[in-house]
């Protein structure tokens, strides 16, 4: 029969024949022959391979370096790499999460639209009319201006995006 030019899924072509790939968690020791199956070997501790493969070396588990603000979110197995995330108050600088930076704070006049996570930074938004923020914070939203009317008071000083309104007593009409 003609030697194959393509192989089935989870197989690879070598020396004009189709050999089985090694399953996740194992590496290739020797290719199959006409008479023998592919020989695979489990990855050792601290190693992994996460796909059907013909790799001759397993990969080393990633190290979540605390000096870079990283911590382990999930320990690696023979089939998965370690997943790193950032310490509280920090977030990853990339999808691979190789280092962390401090969460951004929203300046006065801006409030937190979305609180940061281990993988995303704080999202700030300008305080719209009727709202203010007088602090730099990674958690505080814009606060609504105080409603003087509900306190039977009047606005003595208008609010801004950075300051609340100042309420004062109503001027009494003299008899």
């Amino acid at each position: 029969p003609e030697p194959p030019t393509a192989c089935r899924e989870k197989q690879y072509l070598i020396n004009s024949q189709c050999c089985s790939l090694c399953q996740p968690g194992q590496k290739l020791v020797s290719d199959c022959t006409e008479f023998t199956e592919t020989e695979c070997l489990p990855c050792g501790e601290s190693e992994f391979l996460d796909t059907w493969n013909r790799e001759t070396h397993c990969h080393q588990h990633k190290y979540c370096d605390p000096n870079l603000g990283l911590r382990v979110q999930q320990k690696g197995t023979s089939e998965t790499d370690t997943i790193c995330t950032c310490e509280e108050g920090w977030h990853c600088t990339s999808e691979a999460c190789e280092s962390c930076v401090l969460h951004r704070s929203c300046s006065p006049g801006f409030g937190v639209k979305q609180i940061a996570t281990g993988v995303s930074d704080t999202i700030c938004e300008p305080c719209p009319v009727g709202f203010f923020s007088n602090v730099s914070s990674a958690f505080e939203k814009c606060h609504p201006w105080t409603s003087c009317e509900t306190k039977d008071l009047v606005v003595q000083q208008a609010g801004t995006n950075k300051t609340d309104v100042v309420c004062g007593p109503q001027d009494r009409l003299r008899a």
Epitope: L41, E45, C58
Partner: antibody
């Protein structure tokens, strides 16, 4: 600074049980496997087993199976190794050590000497 | 269980000598670790994943091999290298150490 600090030397009678602690600092114990290694006076290293502190999963060398129990308390970042039915051949230094990551290369405790004598 | 056999069990060498220690496994393993131990001290990891130097380990140490046969080489022995060396496999439970090789001063 990363440290594995083991409990002090013990003297036990044959048939007794010993429990050694290994307190880690400078890292989260759940991020590593903790291995225990035995070394008899003037002899080589013997792997006893390991524990995954995160879920308590253990693997023991069959030669210690039934006599050894490894546990971990993640709230205090401490691993324990208990060895029962002690005999004179258990007189040894016992070490705790971690799995390695590229960047840490495995840490070791200072060792705990256990003497079994009647 | 996988047996790890180290040879020689001891050797005498002089400062500056090239020293080779072998470690043989009864079945193929993914990698081995090499440890150095000095009297009264805990072992120290020298080489991980067969051939990679651990942090702070001098470049005169090197590791090689695959499958069942592995080698630790010290290219030029230094006074601080006189110690006992152990290989360990961490592929199959129970993980096992070689019997050790004691490197002594000639």
């Amino acid at each position: 600074e990363v440290q594995l600090v083991q409990s002090g030397a013990e003297v036990k009678k044959p048939g007794a049980t010993v429990k050694i602690s290994c307190k880690v600092s400078g890292f989260n114990i759940k991020d590593y496997y903790i291995h225990w290694v035995k070394q008899r006076p003037g002899k080589g290293l013997e792997w006893m087993g390991r524990i995954d502190p995160e879920d308590g999963d253990t693997k023991y060398d069959p030669k210690f199976q039934g006599r050894v129990t490894m546990t971990a308390d993640t709230s205090t970042d401490t691993a324990y190794m208990e060895l029962s039915s002690l005999r004179s051949e258990d007189t040894a230094v016992y070490y705790c050590t971690t799995s390695y990551y590229v960047g840490t290369y495995g840490y070791w405790g200072q060792g705990t000497t256990v003497t079994v004598s009647s | 269980d996988i047996q790890m056999t180290q040879s020689p069990s001891s050797l005498s060498a002089s400062v500056g000598d090239r020293v080779t220690i072998t470690c043989s496994a009864t079945s193929s393993v993914s990698y081995i670790l090499w440890f150095q131990q000095k009297p009264g001290k805990a072992p120290k990891l020298l080489i991980y994943s067969t051939s990679n130097l651990a942090s702070g380990v001098p470049s005169r140490f090197s590791g090689s091999g695959s499958g069942t046969d592995f080698t630790l080489t010290i290219s030029s022995l230094q006074p601080e290298d006189f110690a006992t060396y152990y290989c360990q496999q961490r592929t199959f439970y129970p993980y096992t150490f070689g019997g050790g090789t004691k490197v002594e001063i000639k």
